[in-house]
């Protein structure tokens, strides 16, 4: 019958190769020559040529040792054809199953496993899980079935069987009571993984079990009383370092201190943080202290740990007396930024405002004033009274120094303390517009045809603010109205210039007087180039030359 049962081939065969496996045989071979072939991965497709068949004899051959861990099963098809190439059988399934040899040792997934468990835990507490893999078969054989065991424990305190490992899962658990971090902070276990379910090849790894600290010791202040001196107004100033001792594991949550100001800081002036290395409490000023308001603070600070105590423990408290030291404080302008409205162009010597500062110190100190920054040089300040006066012409339209109608000045106040201190203030002068600019046309040069001329529209600009601007009025002077007309549009912001009489090609001055809503008049001469042309022109054409 044209059927082949599965062929079982052990991996790692030593040969010699080619090695016979089985013979393909069709019973249609009576009276006709049959040729055999095989197809499939391992025969005519990758990995090619692992298997071959002798065409005439039908012998199936293996050409190399097999590796189950690479390919565990080959599915081929056997074919039988007559001499003329016609199939005499349907393709036959050939299953080649690679049987496992114990050719791999177990491998731990890590050389060193790390786990941790709290001191004092009860037997049965799980610590960690270790894993070893074995590439061999663990379903049909024990070649890849791994059994775990503990080979040794270091140190052997309080005895050598503190831990156990589950032979199948690799879970390491506590088996004995008496884990004490203060005596043994870490155990090193040599663990084994053995295939054949414990009867085969063995590999080892290390499991390091860290005994975690339980918070059974409270941090204690040493000393418990402190005196400190702090200059007034200093923010973020280190007032005092508070020292604690804690018998628990350094740098663990059971050792790391947490400080709390329990009393004496009603104004929320202080803060206390933990130094990450020394574990000291660093008391600093959150806000400046005011000697004039209160020159001594008594603080009460309590210390606990990041981790809660595992049993009831007394908390330690420290007392800190903070003496505030007087410092010469800078004068403070009131307000720090002062807005004053003043008309532009006021006469020189005219007072602008008085801008003074107050000294926070208790002693009566003399304050003197001066201008620190006056970019246009328009102002002066009386050193004793703080009186600001105009010494130059305040010009709202000065684009270099005035932004959005505001001229900014910085002034300085200095006390006579030792050493003297200074404070600054900002004076913002809002310049009120006066009608000091007349209207100006743009552009001031025009080119126009002397026949059917196009009307010239000129924009009118005025540096002043409303109501010292539009609507504008236009008037031609100096006989310019003989040849020209000037009319302001309805909106009153442009002037239309027209040529009303023929002028020969040349350049002419048009005298245009514009006045604003406040009757501020400005005379402007417009240079008009008249061209021999019709309608619109940009430049005069050259003289016509005959050919």
């Amino acid at each position: 019958e044209w059927v082949m049962p599965p062929i079982f081939v052990p991996e790692n065969g030593k040969g010699p190769f080619p090695q016979r496996l089985n013979q393909l045989k069709s019973n249609k071979d009576r009276g006709t020559k049959i040729f055999y072939s095989i197809t499939g991965p391992g025969a005519d497709s990758p990995p090619e040529g692992v298997f071959a068949v002798e065409k005439e004899t039908g012998w199936l051959l293996l050409n190399k040792p097999l590796d189950r861990e690479e390919i565990a099963k080959y599915e081929l098809f056997g074919h039988a054809v007559s001499e003329n190439g016609a199939s005499v059988e349907d393709p036959m399934n050939i299953s080649i199953i690679v049987t496992d040899q114990n050719d791999h040792k177990p491998k731990f997934t890590q050389d060193t496993f790390r786990g941790s468990v709290l001191e004092g835990v009860l037997p049965g507490t799980s610590v960690m899980q270790v894993t070893a893999t074995d590439e061999d078969d663990a379903i049909y054989t024990y070649n890849g079935v791994v059994a775990y065991s503990i080979h040794s424990q270091e140190p052997k305190d309080p005895h050598d069987l503190m831990f156990t490992i589950h032979r199948s899962t690799g879970t390491i658990s506590v088996i004995s009571s008496g884990l004490d971090r203060e005596k043994v902070p870490e155990y090193t276990l040599t663990i084994q993984a053995t295939d054949m379910d414990g009867d085969g090849s063995t590999t080892t790894a290390v499991a390091v079990v860290e005994i975690l600290d339980a918070n059974d010791n409270a941090p204690m202040f040493d000393p418990q009383k402190y005196e400190a001196h702090v200059p007034e107004n200093a923010v973020g100033h280190e007032v005092q370092r508070l020292t604690v001792t804690d018998l628990d594991a350094p740098n663990s949550p059971a050792w790391r201190a947490t400080y709390l100001i329990m009393g004496g800081d009603d104004g929320d002036h202080f803060t206390i943080t933990t130094h990450p290395e020394s574990n000291q409490g660093i008391l600093t000023t959150r806000k400046g202290l005011d000697f004039e308001a209160k020159n001594q603070h008594t603080l009460y600070v309590e210390v606990t740990n990041e981790a809660p105590f595992v049993l009831k423990l007394p908390t330690s408290t420290a007392t800190i007396v903070v003496h505030v030291e007087d410092v010469n404080e800078a004068p403070v302008f009131v307000p720090p930024s002062k807005v004053v409205e003043v008309q532009e162009g006021i006469p020189t010597g005219e007072p602008v405002c008085v801008y003074t500062a107050e000294d926070p110190d208790k002693e009566n100190q003399k304050i003197s004033y001066r201008i620190l920054r006056d970019p246009a040089g328009w102002l002066a300040m009386d050193p004793d009274s703080g009186q600001v006066t105009a010494v130059g012409t305040l010009d709202r339209e000065d684009e270099q120094f005035v932004r959005n109608n505001i001229y900014e000045v910085m002034v300085l106040a200095m006390d006579n303390g030792s050493p003297p201190t200074t404070g600054t203030g900002t004076l913002l002068l809002t310049l009120i517009d006066v009608n000091d600019h007349g209207p100006v046309p743009e552009p001031r040069q025009i080119t126009i045809c002397n026949q059917s001329p196009v009307r010239q529209v000129l924009n009118i600009t005025d540096k002043d603010l409303s109501p010292h601007t539009s609507p504008f009025q236009a008037q031609l002077t100096d006989d310019s109205d003989i040849y020209w007309t000037a009319e302001v549009n309805e909106e009153g912001d442009t002037v239309v210039l027209s040529l009303k009489k023929f002028l020969k090609q040349d350049t002419y001055d048009v005298h245009l007087s514009l006045s604003d809503h406040g009757n501020k008049e400005q005379l402007t001469v417009i240079r008009a180039t008249v061209c021999d042309c019709h309608g619109h022109v940009e430049t005069c054409p050259g003289p016509w030359k005959g050919g």
Partner: antibody, heavy 118, light 107 residues
Framework: VQLVEESGGGLVKPGGSLKLSCAAS????????MSWVRQTPDKRLEWVAT????????YYPDSVKGRFTISRDNAKNTLYLQMSSLKSEDTAMYYC???????????WGQGTTVTVSS | ELVMTQSPSSLSASLGEGVSLTCRAS??????LIWLRQEPDGTIKRLIY???SLDSGVPKRFSGSRSGSDYSLTISSLESEDFVHYYC?????????FGAGTKLEIK
């Protein structure tokens, strides 16, 4: 009728190289593993090399490994043996032989003589 | 490597007589053994494969057998063309190894 015929033998100095050929006919060459076997002057037979039918895999005894290379050209129905770093002990009659019924050595050629001498 | 010890190295016998040649394997090779004959002109032919299977065209007077690690080629009734060299070859272990040969001579 299965026929295999060797050629390429001759006299070569120690350390020299030689390439033997074996032309096959009368059977489906590409379907059979092929080998080279030699017979030393004292009439002892020694297996030299084998190549799988598709030419993907080759096998050698330690005595020739690294010096001899077996190959085949199925399109030309020809088997080859490239011999290099030849020694006097490689002097022999070299036969090519086919597998048949998956077993060595079903059909043999007439042999070609290789003499390694200075 | 596996050693095949062939005996005798030479054997004198008469026409019509029956003879046996033996090869002993130093390790287990199962049935993986063939017998070859070599003519005086150097021509080599396989007679028996798988210890006892006769190749096509080989006369029935040739037979092969096994007893443990001893493998035998028996010629039941010698004919004139049988007085040549005979070799065994094992293919159960790598590398393939031959026996040293037996020269069958006419008495």
């Amino acid at each position: 009728v299965q026929l295999v015929e060797e050629s390429g033998g001759g006299l070569v100095k120690p350390g020299g190289s030689l390439k033997l050929s074996c032309a096959a006919s009368g059977f489906t060459f590409s379907s059979y593993a092929m080998s080279w076997v030699r017979q030393t002057p004292d009439k002892r037979l020694e297996w030299v090399a084998t190549i799988s039918s598709g030419g993907h895999y080759t096998y050698y005894p330690d005595s020739v490994k690294g010096r001899f290379t077996i190959s085949r050209d199925n399109a030309k129905n020809t088997l080859y043996l490239q011999m290099s770093s030849l020694k006097s002990e490689d002097t022999a009659m070299y036969y090519c032989a086919s597998y048949y019924y998956g077993i060595p050595f079903g059909y043999w050629g007439q042999g070609t003589t290789v003499t390694v001498s200075s | 490597e596996l050693v095949m010890t062939q005996s005798p190295s030479s054997l004198s016998a008469s026409l019509g007589e029956g003879v046996s040649l033996t090869c002993r394997a130093s390790q287990d090779i199962g049935i993986n053994l063939i017998w070859l004959r070599q003519e005086p002109d150097g021509t080599i032919k396989r007679l028996i494969y798988d210890t006892s299977s006769l190749d096509s065209g080989v006369p029935k007077r040739f037979s092969g057998s096994r007893s443990g690690s001893d493998y035998s080629l028996t010629i039941s009734s010698l004919e004139s063309e049988d007085f040549v060299h005979y070799y065994c070859l094992q293919y159960g272990s790598s590398p393939l190894t031959f026996g040293a040969g037996t020269k069958l001579e006419i008495k």
